[in-house]
Interface confidence: medium
């Protein structure tokens, strides 16, 4: 079972001192969102027992394996169901604590009831404050049963549940009708999936015989030991004030485990710590009683004395739970309660025994779960014990389970069961992830999900160039860190695989699936320089550049030209995709803008050094369009145009340009200059008679401006065909050539 304990501090004089702590003894528990262990969760479960909303509870993490819930402001905050979730993957386990109000109308005689499938469960609610109304029993928040107030027996309301099945498990409550739900008695019923003493999918396997109040888990056959006991069968008592599967945790405070409720994974439930009892776990055991909730009786023989934490303390010459075994009877010594080996290993297991007569090699045997008996291959005989060594054949998964070391002499026999866990070495289910790459190194995250068993002790990264037959290079890394593969070849594909290991001999798993990671190109090192540039229009710029001459092929895929408009804070990038190019035309620029220009060579995604920058000023754009353009036919070959000067001119106009085109014609338009910019009228001559013409014009300062609106006019009829239009300014006395 998962080593997870939920502790409730029941010193309830002040709710603000109340706290819940969840402690995990699991390797890597609560480490957070990495691949090796999800965090411990501790929360109030309001799905069944709802309490009035209050200020949020405070969650504090103490290291990786402990989380504490505080911030209870009033007694009603405490009432209800709390849960702690810990363990990873299939071992993720929820531990539940049910808190009753000490001032409730009804109080449970016993909060947690663990029963076997098919048993009869009896829940008993003791009357604390009487009301003469019905008592409503609910199961998981839903109505279940009603009892009349006359039906109380000896001041208790009993709910009998015959032939219980696992779906009957849950939170039960007994409430007086018309009373606050907070005054209910709350119970937790845990129904094991099997009958008494059995476990496994078809309940075909026999439980190991859990001692000291331990409960056999119906899924894996392990004993869930009460707080304060350890060992495969809970046969060993912890020192006072200690708990956890290996007695590794210590109760907080000077009074040890007094006033603490311990909740463990199902099917155990909750109890006081060893040596304590009572609804608030503040009463020491009566003489002759010991263990969690003081449920166990010592019944010590042969002068043994009862310790309320550990049971019988035997005098010299005696041993056993009740000091009933003479030391003359052979005894298995210091056998570990649990051993762990990796799949397909051939471990050596030692079993030591003492007694009178002295055990010899042939009198000690090892029995596997399938009944196979192994005989020892050698024995070490010392004055006080004989240690038999067993060579175990290659382990398979079916060897997981309870093994037994047995010693037999003429003085009697002893046996000790111990749990063997055969673990599957971890195998990555996915390839490692590429985080960043450079031309000569790859940064890789080896953290991947895996099949098999943790914890992960080492991570090996194997890599070699793709399609290579050379040996793999290997780097061993810490499981939680990213790895940098160094001294690689540029622009090369590498096959990369992860291998995970767990502790112990034979803990190395198979290699995970490969992935292809490619190093970046080499960085281009040549620095171009700008040869020159010239303006080809108000928004066009031609740029040319050169590269230094170096031996060997050019390392580069093309050039990147950058134009920086400092006034607007804008950058324009132009990609020239040929490494042979040495000139480029940049269009669509902003007229009148001061640009900083540079060029750099690129290779793949890497940029080389930029050229020294150049500063370029584009000429401003032309003036606005002339206004109110008007056309008037004067004869069969002349049309007069009139207009008004553009507004808001940036400088003096150098000339006007008139565009003439036959309406609907397919030919190119004709442009005619008006070189006297002060004029606002001109006559276009040499036109064809009875022909419709389109006119528009624009002004020029340093550059040509915007076109005016287009006007339309027809020449008068009956004229001769003209040679082509010419223009005459209003102030001019002679015509201008076309």
């Amino acid at each position: 079972a998962v080593d997870l304990t939920l502790l409730a501090n029941l010193r309830l004089t002040d709710p603000q001192r109340f706290f819940l702590t969840c402690v995990s003894g699991e390797a890597g528990a609560g480490r957070g969102s990495d691949a090796w262990g999800p965090p411990l969760l501790l929360e109030k479960d309001d799905r069944i027992v709802r309490t009035p909303p209050g200020p949020p509870l405070r969650l504090a993490r103490n290291g990786s394996h402990q989380v504490t819930l505080r911030g209870f402001s009033k007694p009603s905050d405490l009432v209800g169901v709390f849960s702690c979730v810990g363990g990873a993957g299939a071992r993720r386990t929820r531990v539940i604590y049910v808190h009753n109000s000490p001032g409730a109308h009804l109080l449970p005689d016993k909060v947690t009831h663990t029963v076997n499938k098919g048993d009869t469960a009896v829940l008993s609610a003791r009357v604390h404050k009487e009301k003469q109304t019905d008592v409503i029993w609910k199961s998981n928040g839903s109505y279940f049963y009603t009892l009349d107030w006359h039906e109380a027996q000896d001041g208790r309301f009993l709910l009998q549940l015959p032939n219980v099945q696992p779906p009957s498990s849950g939170i039960y409550s007994a409430t007086y009708l018309e009373a606050s739900p907070l005054g209910s008695a709350f119970f937790r019923l845990i129904v094991r999936g099997c009958g008494a003493g059995r476990w496994g999918p078809g309940c075909t396997k026999e439980c190991p015989g859990c001692l000291h109040g331990g409960v056999c888990h119906d899924h894996d056959g392990e004993c869930v030991c009460p707080p304060g006991f350890t060992g495969t069968r809970c046969e060993q008592a912890c020192r006072e004030g200690r708990f956890g599967q290996s007695c590794q945790e210590q109760c907080p405070g000077i009074s040890g485990c007094r006033g603490l409720t311990f909740c463990l994974p199902d099917p155990y439930g909750c109890s006081c710590g060893s040596g304590w009892r009572g609804s608030q776990c503040q009463e020491a055991c009566a003489p002759g009683h010991f263990g969690a909730d003081c449920r166990l009786q010592c019944q010590c023989q042969n002068g043994g004395t009862c310790d309320r934490f550990s049971g019988c303390v035997c005098p010299s010459g005696w041993h056993g739970v009740h000091c009933e075994k003479s030391d003359r009877i052979p005894q298995i010594l210091n056998m570990a309660s649990e051993l762990e080996f990796n799949l397909e290993t051939m471990p050596r297991i030692n079993c030591a025994a003492a007694g009178n007569p002295f055990p010899v090699r042939g009198s000690i045997e090892l029995r596997k779960p399938d009944g196979t008996v192994l005989l020892s291959t050698k024995a070490i005989v010392e004055p006080e014990k004989t240690t038999a060594e067993f060579e175990v054949p290659r382990l398979v998964l079916a060897d997981s389970g309870f093994w037994e070391c047995r010693v037999s002499t003429s003085g009697g026999q002893d046996s000790r069961r111990f749990k063997v866990n055969v673990k599957v070495p971890p195998v990555p289910l996915a390839a490692p992830r590429l985080l960043t790459k450079q031309s000569r190194q790859l940064v890789v995250s080896p953290l991947v999900s895996f099949s098999g068993d943790g914890p992960i002790s080492t991570v090996r990264l194997h890599y070699r160039p793709q399609d290579s037959t050379m040996d793999w290079s290997t780097i061993v890394v810490d499981p939680s860190e990213n790895v940098t593969l160094m001294n690689l070849r540029p622009k090369t594909g590498y096959s990369v695989r992860v291998q995970l290991s767990r502790p112990g001999e034979g803990g190395e798993g198979a290699w995970g699936p490969p992935t292809l990671m490619t190093t970046d190109c080499p960085e281009p090192l040549l620095q171009p320089w700008l040869e020159g540039w010239h303006v080809e229009g108000t928004d066009r710029l031609r740029v040319s550049w050169s590269l230094p001459l170096v031996p060997g092929p050019l390392v580069g895929d093309g050039f990147l030209l950058r134009l920086w408009d400092g006034t607007r804070g804008q950058e324009r990038r132009e990609n020239v995709s040929s490494p042979q190019a040495r000139t480029a035309l940049l269009t669509g620029l902003t007229p009148g803008t001061h640009y900083q220009l540079d060029v750099q060579l690129y290779h793949c995604t890497l940029l080389g050094p930029a050229s020294p920058p150049a500063h370029v000023l584009l000429p401003p754009s032309g003036p606005p369009a002339p206004r109110h353009l008007h056309a008037q036919a004067l004869s069969d070959s002349e049309i007069q145009l009139t207009w008004k000067h553009p507004e808001a001119l940036p400088g003096p106009i150098s000339k006007y340009v008139v565009e003439v085109q036959v309406a609907g014609g397919a030919g190119d338009p004709l442009w005619i200059d008006v070189d006297r910019p002060e004029e606002t009228s001109t006559i276009i001559r040499g036109l064809n008679a009875s022909t419709r013409y389109l006119f528009r014009m624009r002004a020029s300062i340093q550059g040509l401006g915007d076109w005016s609106n287009t006007v339309e006019e027809s020449t008068l009829g009956n004229g001769l065909q003209a040679e082509g239009p010419v223009q005459e300014s209003r102030a001019a006395e002679e015509g201008l050539d076309q």
Epitope: T133, D134, I136, K138, S142, Y143, F144, Y145, T146, L147, D148, H150, E151, L177, E178
Partner: antibody
Framework: EVQLLESGGGLVQPGGSLRLSCAAS???????KMWWVRQAPGKGLEWVS?????????YYADSVKGRFTISRDNSKNTLYLQMNSLRAEDTAVYYC????????????WGQGTMVTVSS | DIQMTQSPATLSLSPGERATLSCRAS???????LAWYQQKPGQAPRLLIY???NRATGIPARFSGSGSGTDFTLTISGLEPEDFVVYYC?????????FGGGTKVEIK
């Protein structure tokens, strides 16, 4: 589907007896308190009797105390009302009812059975 | 025993109008244990409201309940043709329970 179905009503002379049944289906009958409620023609509703899940606790309205007996057979999912010493004022439609959802009020009713006491 | 008195005995209204039915207890009743039922001719009663103000499953939003202590109210915000029937209040929550005498809502 949760259902209650009454039967056993009919015409009976004053002083006579009658046994009503209420067959329950669609829920765990043995867990619920069961009620009989009646309604005289043109009149309002009147509570008659209640029996608790185990059958060990029963209550009656003053108007029927000593004459009517409520009982249940949890193995048959059936509720009964044994009516003795019937009077004309017992003439009514008799309904069985439960609070199926745990709200306390009657959210499931039978269709009713008519009892007429007349000479 | 607690007596429950409903008023008026008959309420004459037109469809679409708002109906307000009153139920008064002879002594204080927990609002958690006050229910309203609707009964159509020839049918068993149907639970409308429990706990004085909670609509039962499938009951339209035009039905609402309120009140505490000794005075409770059932309101039908806009009467539909099928709402012109009899309504009962009930005190429940102990082994004996009491119904009101009923209010008949009829079409004006």
């Amino acid at each position: 589907e949760v259902q209650l179905l009454e039967s056993g009503g009919g015409l009976v002379q004053p002083g006579g007896s009658l046994r009503l049944s209420c067959a329950a289906s669609g829920f765990t009958f043995s867990q619920y308190k069961m009620w009989w409620v009646r309604q005289a023609p043109g009149k309002g509703l009147e509570w008659v009797s209640v029996i608790y899940p185990s059958g060990g606790v029963t209550y009656y309205a003053d108007s029927v105390k000593g004459r009517f007996t409520i009982s249940r057979d949890n193995s048959k999912n059936t509720l009964y009302l044994q009516m003795n010493s019937l009077r004309a004022e017992d003439t009514a439609v008799y309904y069985c009812a439960i609070s199926y959802s745990p709200v306390g009020a009657f959210d499931i009713w039978g269709q009713g059975t008519m009892v007429t006491v007349s000479s | 025993d607690i007596q429950m008195t409903q008023s008026p005995a008959t309420l004459s209204l037109s469809p679409g109008e708002r109906a307000t039915l009153s139920c008064r207890a002879s002594q204080s009743v927990s609002s958690s244990y006050l229910a309203w039922y609707q009964q159509k001719p020839g049918q068993a009663p149907r639970l409308l409201i429990y706990g004085a103000s909670n609509r039962a499953t499938g009951i339209p939003a035009r039905f609402s309940g309120s009140g505490s202590g000794t005075d409770f109210t059932l309101t039908i915000s806009g009467l539909e043709p099928e709402d012109f029937v009899v309504y009962y209040c009930q005190k429940y929550g102990s082994s004996s329970l009491t119904f009101g005498g009923g209010t008949k809502v009829e079409i004006k």
